[in-house]
């Protein structure tokens, strides 16, 4: 039994880091393998993660972490029974994938303005809470070409757009994702999308 693709890990910078790897053949990850991880710190103890299958030879493990700070470094040991298959380390702050925003809502009752709001996925005491920026994706269910991205570079989790920038009388969907420049993170997954019917009063034209 050998590791074909070494574990790579990403952290949500809150409580979970996810490590994925591939073995050299079909493996029952949960019965055959264990991933041991330990914070490099005087008071820390080793923890064991039981991996799950992720395709035939792929494994994934969700490492539970009490808290994350920028200097944290973890040792990782991948075991098959008594055999050490791989040894490595992981610094969560260097491999951050933020949590996806939630509770995306489209408010359509504000004088021909669409107000999109969503929730910051982090609690106020987490470092990322004040460092997230967002991308909002809006698209038409009827027209695949009607697809747009709005970058929200301010901290407030909201976006206002004129309803007239979208076509009237058709349905749209929106979703939002987050990233943090401070840790050069990857983008989060997209939030679940929300749907609304776009309608607004055309301005009265005088001839």
């Amino acid at each position: 039994m050998k590791v074909l693709q070494e574990p790579t890990c990403v952290s949500d910078y809150m409580s979970i880091s996810t490590c994925e790897w591939k073995m050299n053949g079909p493996t029952n990850c949960s019965t055959e393998l264990r991933l041991l991880y330990q914070l490099v710190f005087l008071l820390s103890e080793a923890h064991t993660c039981i991996p799950e299958n992720n395709g035939g030879a792929g494994c994934v493990c969700h490492l539970l972490m009490d808290d994350v700070v920028s200097a944290d470094n973890y040792t990782l040991d991948l075991w098959a029974g008594q055999q050490l298959l791989w040894k490595g380390s992981f610094k969560p702050s260097e491999h951050v994938k933020p949590r996806a925003p939630g509770n995306l809502t489209v408010h359509t009752n504000v004088s021909d303005t669409l107000l999109l709001t969503w929730s910051n996925p982090y609690p106020p005491d987490n470092y990322l809470y004040n460092h997230l920026t967002y991308a909002v994706n809006i698209w038409s269910e009827n027209d695949p070409a009607d697809f747009r991205i709005y970058n929200v570079t301010y901290l407030e989790p909201s976006l206002r757009i004129a309803a007239s920038t979208l076509k009237s009388g058709i349905s749209y969907r929106a979703r939002v994702r987050a990233w943090a420049q401070c840790y050069n993170t990857t983008w989060s997954e997209w939030s679940p999308s929300t749907k609304w019917h776009n309608s607004y009063r055309e301005p009265f034209e005088q001839h």
Partner: antibody, heavy 120, light 106 residues
Framework: DVQLQESGPGLVKPSQSLSLTCTVT?????????WNWIRQFPGNKLEWMGY???????SYNPSLKSRISITRDTSKNQFFLQLNSVTTDDTATYYC?????????????WGQGTTLTVSS | QIVLSQSPAILSASPGEKVTMTCRAT?????MHWYQQKPGSSPKPWIY???NLASGVPARFSGSGSGTSYSLTISRVEAEDTATYYC?????????FGAGTKLELK
Amino acid sequence: DVQLQESGPGLVKPSQSLSLTCTVTGYSITSDYAWNWIRQFPGNKLEWMGYISYSGSSSYNPSLKSRISITRDTSKNQFFLQLNSVTTDDTATYYCAGGGLRRRGLFDYWGQGTTLTVSS
Amino acid sequence: QIVLSQSPAILSASPGEKVTMTCRATSSVTYMHWYQQKPGSSPKPWIYATSNLASGVPARFSGSGSGTSYSLTISRVEAEDTATYYCQQWSSIPLTFGAGTKLELK
């Protein structure tokens, strides 16, 4: 609300042993944290003396290792400092403090301190 | 053991001024903490793991650094900040403290 309270003799003669007690309320000393003794000398210099962890393992400042012992009584939620062969150099304010993994050992909780004078 | 040297020993500042105090270690440190102590009181946790503010610490305080050099900055000093600030490492035994920086108001 976690609170720590030191208690001890206040005055000890040179060459005798010092015994201090830290009583913890609002948190079980077996749940988490390293439970430390720290002292502050008259010139305000702080010195870490040692800890006993929630699991019962202990670690000491090598400069005190031959003289120090930190133990606990889990039934009373107390931990103790014993320092042997004291000299006038051990005159200080003695603090107990709790520091845990979550804040990477930050001493989150401190007692108000007890002043110890070593004098004949 | 890791020796922590704090500078300056005494820092005199006017209200509203920005001040920075430093803590240098003789060996690399992973986690540096800071405490505030006022006369007659025990030290209070102030900043943990280099840059994280402890509960109740005003946002005008910040911490930074890595390796052997760390600093605590107050963006706008207020009268209530008058105190002695100690750095402390928990990277190797024995745990050690700096000698402190005493912040005074002009």
